[in-house]
């Protein structure tokens, strides 16, 4: 499907609005420090150029690849070396090396200020004064902070952002209408970003075979009535979409995602009975809906798997003929029967099955050797079941904040070398698994919990890769994608760790504590808790609980005082001294 001008092809397929939005996202994800106005200028220049190519595909430079066009445009930025340092060296390279170089310089933790939400009236005025600029600013600010955000999905978020302002800025109580919607978009956006980051890590660090295996398992759970060939086609197409988006090819990615949505809606009967309501929606909403669609009902008459995968005398013959196809079919068959399993568990089972066949098909009596292969799955299944049961029990006992604290202590003891902000961020997010998954019925708990934990632990891996400090983290992150969570779960107290020297400054607090939101107060306290464990890794839970209770009481007392700062100055050193004594 070759076109004389790739840029004209994508402009015509996507339309001007989506074209401009996607180019803005692409540029913002590459040059994360550039000011908004600079990106808008670049996007306008690219758009004008694209229009000339639509008018005449033979016009000068219209035959160039998108990477060449976009890369050339990015390399015109005057302050590239001052702002980005060695990233400027990318511009000396030729495609495709130049694009690879830009990709390698994407920063998962850019040094950008947190987004501050202005007053509702200020936002509504800005929205009414210049809606287009307001929405572009949203795309820019999200994309530069989340350089792997799934671009076509970000357009969907922007559409919802626009709809929220259009509705709520007319409402009698603007704030009551708007703020919950913005909170929801923020939380869903962070979750969407983290999920996509795992997909990109899977593709980039473990290859498309790993991603395809994940997709076979997930789509087989969603579409248990679909034939294996149908699932395989969807997996191939989905892999192409995500490979493109993770590689910065956002126009191709969005175009192919639209094609995939079209195909799914034209072939609902052979995919799933759950697609109907998605397929009536406009494009962005439709694609989102299809991605989030609930699992279809399992066919009633599915036979036992043992016949084809254990009892059959042809197992080794079938395996040898086409290993990946045979394993893919095994994974498909297992996953469609087990919506109650996490995708990661299903992949572990497929891996265990593959290892057994590799060993047994070379044995004297293969059938005798692999006859009990399904029995070997039992401990693999029980491990996440027990983990979810235990952690949900702990969550229900402690509540979210204290559950997060338990995880903070646990992970700080496991990997105390990791930076305190990273431990706080990751443990807080690990702790959110309780509220998200523990209320669900038993059959949905494990897929919810373990697949969510995989997303959160990927964030730890991504941050740690930027600044590696722990061999244990590197090992868990790089050895096996599917065993990351069990690897972290199995880590014990790091006995080799030399406790951090006590620093009174770390435990010095001021009156500004009192004006913080509840969430910010929690983060402050949790930061102190991590530092406490780094200082005393063998402190007992009772000791830590005692110190944290005293901390809460001290902050509450000083925030009620008339002279708050004086109280913090006087009571702070007492709290520090008492804490040191309690932990001695």
């Amino acid at each position: 499907d070759t076109h004389k001008s790739e840029v004209a092809h994508r402009f015509k397929d996507l339309g001007e609005e989506h074209f401009k939005g996607l180019v803005l996202v692409a540029f913002s994800q590459y040059l994360q420090q550039c000011p908004f106005e600079e990106h808008v200028k670049l996007v306008n220049e690219v758009t004008e150029f694209a229009k000339t190519c639509v008018a005449d595909e033979s016009a000068e430079n219209c035959d160039k690849s998108l990477h060449t066009l976009f890369g050339d445009k990015l390399c015109t930025v005057a302050t590239l070396r001052e702002t980005y340092g060695e990233m400027a060296d990318c511009c000396a390279k030729q495609e495709p090396e130049r694009n690879e170089c830009f990709l390698q310089h994407k920063d998962d933790n850019p040094n950008l200020p947190p987004l501050v939400r202005p007053e509702v009236d200020v936002m509504c005025t800005a929205f009414h004064d210049n809606e287009a600029t307001f929405l572009k600013k949203y795309l820019y600010e999200v994309a530069r902070r989340h350089p792997y955000f799934y671009a076509p999905e970000l357009l969907f978020f922007a559409a919802r952002y626009k709809a929220a302002f259009a509705e709520c800025c007319q409402a009698a109580d603007k704030a009551a209408c708007l703020l919950p919607k913005l909170d929801e978009l923020r939380d869903e956006g962070k979750a969407s970003s983290a999920k996509q980051r795992l997909k990109c890590a899977s593709l980039q660090k473990f290859g498309d075979r790993a991603f395809k295996a994940w997709a076979v398992a997930r789509l087989s759970q969603k579409f248990p009535k679909a034939e294996f060939a149908e699932v395989s086609k969807l997996v191939t197409d989905l892999t192409k979409v995500h490979t493109e988006c993770c590689h910065g090819d956002l126009l191709e990615c969005a175009d192919d995602r639209a094609d995939l949505a079209k195909y799914m809606c034209e072939n609902q009967d052979s995919i799933s009975s759950k697609l109907k309501e998605c397929c009536d929606k406009p494009l962005l909403e439709k694609s989102h809906c299809l991605a989030e669609v609930e699992n279809d009902e399992m066919p009633a008459d599915l036979p036992s798997l043992a016949a084809d995968y254990v009892e059959s005398k042809d197992v080794c013959k079938n395996y040898a003929e086409a290993k990946d196809v045979f394993l893919g079919m095994f994974l498909y068959e297992y996953a469609r029967r087990h919506p109650d399993y996490s995708v990661m568990l299903l992949l572990r089972l497929a891996k265990a099955y593959e290892a057994t066949l590799e060993k047994c098909c070379a044995a004297a009596d293969p059938h005798e050797c692999y006859a009990k292969v399904f029995d070997e799955f039992q401990p693999l299944v029980e491990e996440p079941q027990n983990l979810v049961k235990q952690n949900c029990e702990l969550f229900e006992q402690l509540g979210e904040y204290k559950f997060q604290n338990a995880l903070l202590v646990r992970y700080t003891k496991k990997v105390p070398q990791v930076s305190t902000p990273t431990l706080v961020e990751v443990s807080r997010n690990l702790g959110k698994v309780g509220a998200k998954c523990c209320k669900l019925p038993e059959a949905k708990r494990m897929p919810c919990a373990e697949d969510y934990l995989s997303v959160v632990l990927n964030r730890l891996c991504v941050l740690h890769e930027k600044t590696p400090v722990s061999e244990k983290v590197t090992k868990c992150c790089t050895e096996s994608l599917v065993n990351r969570r069990p690897c972290f779960s199995a880590l014990e107290l790091d006995e080799a760790y030399v406790p951090k020297a006590f620093n009174a400054e770390t435990f010095t607090f001021h009156a500004d504590m009192c004006t913080l939101s509840e969430k910010e107060k929690q983060v402050k306290k949790q930061t102190a808790l991590v530092e406490l464990v780094k200082h005393k890794p063998k402190a007992t839970k009772e000791q830590l609980k005692g110190v944290m209770d005293n901390f809460a009481a001290f902050v509450e007392k000083c925030c009620k005082a008339d002279d708050k700062e004086a109280c913090f100055a006087e009571e702070g050193p007492k709290f520090v001294a008492a804490s040191q004594a309690a932990l001695a």
């Epitope: 235990q390 702990l394 006992q397 402690l398 003891k413």
Partner: nanobody, 124 residues
Framework: EVQLVESGGGLVQAGGSLRLSCAAS????????MGWFRQAPGKEREFVAT????????YYADSVKGRFTISRDNAKNTVYLQMNSLKPEDTAVYYC?????????????????WGQGTQVTVSS
Amino acid sequence: EVQLVESGGGLVQAGGSLRLSCAASGRTFSSYAMGWFRQAPGKEREFVATINWSGGSTYYADSVKGRFTISRDNAKNTVYLQMNSLKPEDTAVYYCAADLYGPGFVLSMEYDYWGQGTQVTVSS
């Protein structure tokens, strides 16, 4: 602070049984998950079994499942490990451990208080 004292270890023939006890001092015994761990000579300490604070949840290592049973009596501040069908590979020092608030995790780092251990030797 919780003190733990194990008893009931000894020498037993393969196929035989033993019952280990762990007595805890302290008024808050029922707030703790209790675990049994073991360490064979030259090996790492390994998880054996655990029971949550109420006794409602138990977990076992695959190697002992179906042979060992953990139980507790909160009125007596005691946790038990009934070991049946013992094998020579069960030979080890058995430790009792306590974890505040825990549902009974399998990691030794979760447990703050440990007993001195009791020797179990299974001869063939």
